[in-house]
């Protein structure tokens, strides 16, 4: 199995969750740091990230298949300040591995709604504050 990283988003009321998911082998978890950057085209690193998560080996997980680890960054209420380009990344200095997810964007519209574009799973997500639903 190949190590990879994916980005996704979910809405809970007015909250927007940005999710970075890393798929990896159980034994490769240790040493990995997953992080989310905003408006960092070339220098996305744990030090410049909005949030980071250090993975640890979980001895309770049986088998040697692929497992997933998630970092979740929650925006309680999206404002124009949250507009920008985001990227999920992961790094393991222990293994010399760098993973860079696709860029995705949050665009705050004049109507008070916002759209999330560029996510691989769903190409275009549109969120409405008023309705609190995915449209």
């Amino acid at each position: 199995g190949c190590i990879n990283i994916t980005s996704s988003a979910s809405q809970e009321g007015t909250r927007l969750n940005l999710i970075c998911t890393v798929w990896h082998k159980k034994e490769e978890a240790e040493g990995f740091v997953v992080f989310l950057c905003k408006d960092r085209s070339g220098d996305c690193s744990p030090e410049t990230s909005l949030k980071q998560l250090r993975l640890k080996r979980d001895p309770g997980i049986d088998g040697v298949g692929e497992i997933s680890s998630q970092l979740m960054f929650t925006i309680s209420q999206v404002t124009p300040l949250h507009s920008g380009t985001y990227q999920c990344c992961a790094r393991s200095q222990k293994s010399g591995i760098r993973l860079q997810g696709h860029f995705f964007s949050i665009l705050f519209t004049e109507t008070g709604n916002y759209t999330v574009t560029g996510l691989k799973q769903r190409q275009h997500l549109e969120f409405s504050h008023n309705e609190g639903t995915l449209s």
Epitope: Q93, S95, G96, I97
Partner: antibody, heavy 112, light 107 residues
Framework: QVNLQESGPGLVQPSETLSLTCTVS????????VYWVRQPPGKGLEWMGR???????DYNPALKSRLSISRDTSKSQVFLKLNSLQTEDTAIYFC??????WGQGTLVTVSS | DIQMTQSPASLSASLGETVSIECLAS??????LAWYQQKPGKSPQLLIY???SLQDGVPSRFSGSGSGTQYSLKINSLESEDVATYFC?????????FGGGTKLELK
């Protein structure tokens, strides 16, 4: 089984360029990074630089002006070039898969 | 660069004894510390990563601890095969740096 093997000249003249090759097996260079570390005889370890799985490189600032690391993924080889050699560059040169698996090292002597 | 000060530089101990090796970082390295064992003429072998995580195949008599700037490697019930030089490594900050090494000998 993960294996790394360093190869290159045992003796290099001062002011010349050192070229070393690290040939790997048991893993893909697009999945794991390779680091270079050196050790002067009887002394400590110095990290020189690395090439990540995605092909990006980092260098020790103390060596950056003289060092370059590249790779040929199809041949499973990583290359180190260190120019303007001085006698202080005499060392055992190791390549490693990240921090976990190391080659046995190759001794390079810089002398005229 | 972060300086890693390792102590002692050399250590003599008897079989069955417990020994400790210390590494002091010049600034907080947030547990991003590894310990290596190197035998003469051989390449370093990773013992411990992230301050306290024992690597696969490493005997349980080896253990690592510490946080912030202070870290230690402990070898319980010393065996003859443990005679080697031990190095610490920080990879918290670029560039990664090693301690100067501790040579462990038998009394």
């Amino acid at each position: 089984q993960v294996n790394l093997q360093e190869s290159g000249p045992g003796l290099v003249q001062p002011s010349e360029t050192l070229s070393l090759t690290c040939t790997v097996s048991g893993f893909s260079l697009t999945s794991y990074g390779v680091y270079w570390v050196r050790q002067p005889p009887g002394k400590g370890l110095e990290w020189m630089g690395r090439i990540w799985n995605d092909g990006g490189t980092d260098y020790n600032p103390a060596l950056k002006s003289r060092l370059s690391i590249s790779r040929d993924t199809s041949k499973s080889q990583v290359f180190l070039k260190l120019n303007s050699l001085q006698t202080e560059d005499t060392a055992i040169y190791f390549c490693a898969r990240g921090w976990t698996h190391w080659g046995q090292g190759t001794l390079v002597t810089v002398s005229s | 660069d972060i300086q890693m000060t390792q102590s002692p530089a050399s250590l003599s101990a008897s079989l069955g004894e417990t020994v400790s090796i210390e590494c002091l970082a010049s600034e907080d390295i947030y547990n991003n510390l590894a310990w290596y064992q190197q035998k003469p003429g051989k390449s370093p072998q990773l013992l411990i990563y992230y301050a306290s995580s024992l690597q696969d195949g490493v005997p349980s008599r080896f253990s690592g601890s510490g946080s912030g700037t202070q870290y230690s490697l402990k070898i319980n019930s010393l065996e003859s095969e443990d005679v080697a030089t031990y190095f610490c490594l920080q990879d918290s900050e670029y560039p990664p740096t090693f301690g100067g090494g501790t040579k462990l000998e038998l009394k």
